[in-house]
């Protein structure tokens, strides 16, 4: 679960409510920065099926964020 800061929001819209756990390759969390004032959770899917923005307010996103914060802090 990498964590990094960057400029400008990447996700168009809030994102999907959930992604099948079996489809998740990795999850990246982008914390608010000068140019993007919200947290963004980007899921990379297995088998080169692209990525999905996961709604940071969803239950699944909150679990992922918690897991990352436990690991990093």
């Amino acid at each position: 679960f990498p964590m990094f800061k960057r400029g400008r929001c990447l996700c168009i819209g809030p994102g999907v409510k959930a992604v099948k756990v079996a489809d998740i390759e990795k999850a990246s969390i982008m914390y608010p920065s000068n140019n993007c004032d919200k947290i963004e959770v980007i899921i990379t899917l297995k088998e080169n099926k692209g990525q999905r923005c996961l709604n940071p307010k969803s239950k699944q996103a909150r679990l992922i964020i918690k897991k990352v914060e436990r690991k990093n802090f």
Epitope: L10, C11, I12, G13, V16, K17, I42, R52, C53
Partner: nanobody, 118 residues
């Protein structure tokens, strides 16, 4: 190779309409999220709309809500952005984005220019 080709832009008077198309190839269209974003000269890029098949959801930026409609034709692997009641401030180059995620600047498509005159 994933390819997204935008078309349908043009010059239109304020209050007019345009329909943009985003033709997708190089990936399966059964579980997709495709978005539109725009870049006006001297302005920040702006996410405009997104459609996602996995949860049948659509999103619209506040600036276009009630005027723009996003839709898709899975048989044609194409996503459309119907733009009605256009305003001069909608003038920009419009790009489509796979996964509803704005890619790094170097990998944007050619986009389609929309110019709204007053």
């Amino acid at each position: 190779e994933v390819q997204l080709v935008e078309s349908g832009g043009g010059l239109v008077q304020a209050g007019g309409s345009l329909r943009l198309s985003c033709a997708a190839s190089g990936f399966t269209f059964d579980d997709y999220a495709i978005g539109w974003f725009r870049q006006a000269p001297g302005k920040e890029r702006e996410g405009v709309s997104c459609i996602s098949s996995s949860d049948d959801s659509t999103y619209y930026a506040d600036s276009v809500k009630g005027r723009f409609t996003i839709s898709s034709d899975t048989a044609k692997n194409t996503v459309y952005l119907q733009m009605d009641s256009l305003k001069p401030e909608d003038t920009a180059v419009y790009y489509c984005a796979k996964d509803c995620i704005i890619p790094p600047i170097g990998s944007w498509g050619q986009g389609t220019q929309v110019t709204v005159s007053s």
